[in-house]
């Protein structure tokens, strides 16, 4: 293990298509993987007319884009499907949207999880 980084051992799990995929809808997912690989948590969601619809949450594969990110933040400008990843147990419980734009004051749209998505 590399010192100074948080080991991801479990992540919040959510699947909007749980009936179709025949999985649980929510829970905690243990993150397995090869010993030489880093593990991450992720969240994927959509913004439908200002309403946040979570698509999936869970463990994510070793991904340099997720290294040393303690917070789950999407930085792409207005994607159709939002994605963020992070390191640390359950770090995907909360996720945010902070688009990187060429303006002095970037707008922020922090996402606060609400039922029915979370227990």
């Amino acid at each position: 293990a590399i010192l100074g980084r948080s080991e991801t051992q479990e992540c919040l799990f959510f699947n909007a298509n749980w009936e179709k995929d025949r999985t649980n809808q929510t829970g905690v997912e243990p993150c397995y993987g090869d010993k030489d690989k880093r593990r991450h948590c992720f969240a994927t969601w959509k913004n439908i007319s200002g309403s946040i619809e979570i698509v999936k949450q869970g463990c994510w594969l070793d991904d340099i884009n997720c290294y040393d990110r303690t917070d789950c933040v999407e930085k792409k400008d207005s994607p159709e499907v939002y994605f963020c990843c992070c390191e640390g147990n359950m770090c995907n419980e909360k996720f945010s949207y902070f688009p990187e734009m060429e303006v002095t004051q970037p707008t922020s749209n922090p996402v606060t999880p609400k039922p029915p998505y979370y227990n």
Epitope: K20, Y32, F42, D63, F83
Partner: antibody, heavy 120, light 107 residues
Framework: EVQLLESGGGLVQPGGSLRLSCAAS????????MNWVRQAPGKGLEWVSG????????SYADSVKGRFTISRDNSKNTLYLQMNSLRAEDTAVYYC?????????????WGQGTLVTVSS | DIQMTQSPSSLSASVGDRVTITCRAS??????LNWYQQKPGKAPKLVIY???SLASGVPSRFSGSGSGTDFTLTISSLQPEDFATYYC?????????FGGGTKVEIK
């Protein structure tokens, strides 16, 4: 070293059955989701079925739903595909492949494949 | 089902060339996109996962880019062992679906 070894392929008549096996070694089998992917002669890749690490969740392509059943025995480090009511269009090389999670299904290790031929 | 469209279906290139293969999804799949290499008579091999991450043991001349619906696999300097068929695959939604493949041949 991760190894996946398929077996059970062969020639079968339309309407017949086959059971494919995939023996896994070199990793903790019970930690990983597994999938079957097939490739008809001269064609591209087609996902067939997937199963999560403990066998609790399974998923199938529409083309095989109701005819094929995926299962696993973690005590034997083995993945199975029971194929019933086989059709000519099921003729293909069948690969088993490892996946880390249900939702980030990059198939990082594949077996060498086993050929299934459905013909009268 | 999500449709994956690859282009071109085949291309001819020389050793040392820069090669680019594109893959388009019928709907946004965020970064749930993987690339595989397959040589005749062999099993596919994972090259790129999560759109941009290099799989273990894959040379750094391979790279992936894109997000949403449009993705690219680039080989910066084609080597003799790179002549093969390449497939993209989405893992955003079940069923998992593959592109039709791009055959990279020797010019």
């Amino acid at each position: 070293e991760v190894q996946l070894l398929e077996s059970g392929g062969g020639l079968v008549q339309p309407g017949g059955s086959l059971r494919l096996s995939c023996a896994a070694s070199g990793f903790t089998f019970s930690d990983y989701g597994m999938n079957w992917v097939r490739q008809a002669p001269g064609k591209g890749l087609e996902w067939v079925s997937g199963i999560n690490y403990n066998g609790g969740y399974t998923s199938y392509a529409d083309s095989v739903k109701g005819r094929f059943t995926i299962s696993r025995d973690n005590s034997k480090n083995t993945l199975y595909l029971q194929m019933n009511s086989l059709r000519a269009e099921d003729t293909a090389v069948y690969y088993c492949a490892r996946a880390a999670n249900w939702h980030d299904t990059a198939l990082d290790y594949w077996g060498q494949g086993t050929l299934v031929t459905v013909s009268s | 089902d999500i449709q994956m469209t690859q282009s071109p279906s085949s291309l001819s290139a020389s050793v040392g060339d820069r090669v680019t293969i594109t893959c388009r999804a019928s709907q946004s799949i965020s970064r749930y996109l993987n690339w595989y290499q397959q040589k005749p008579g062999k099993a596919p091999k994972l090259v790129i996962y999560a759109a941009t991450s290099l799989a273990s043991g894959v040379p750094s001349r391979f790279s992936g880019s894109g997000s949403g619906t449009d993705f690219t696999l680039t080989i910066s300097s084609l080597q003799p062992e790179d002549f093969a068929t390449y497939y993209c695959q989405q893992s955003y939604d079940n069923p998992l679906t593959f592109g039709g493949g791009t055959k990279v041949e020797i010019k």
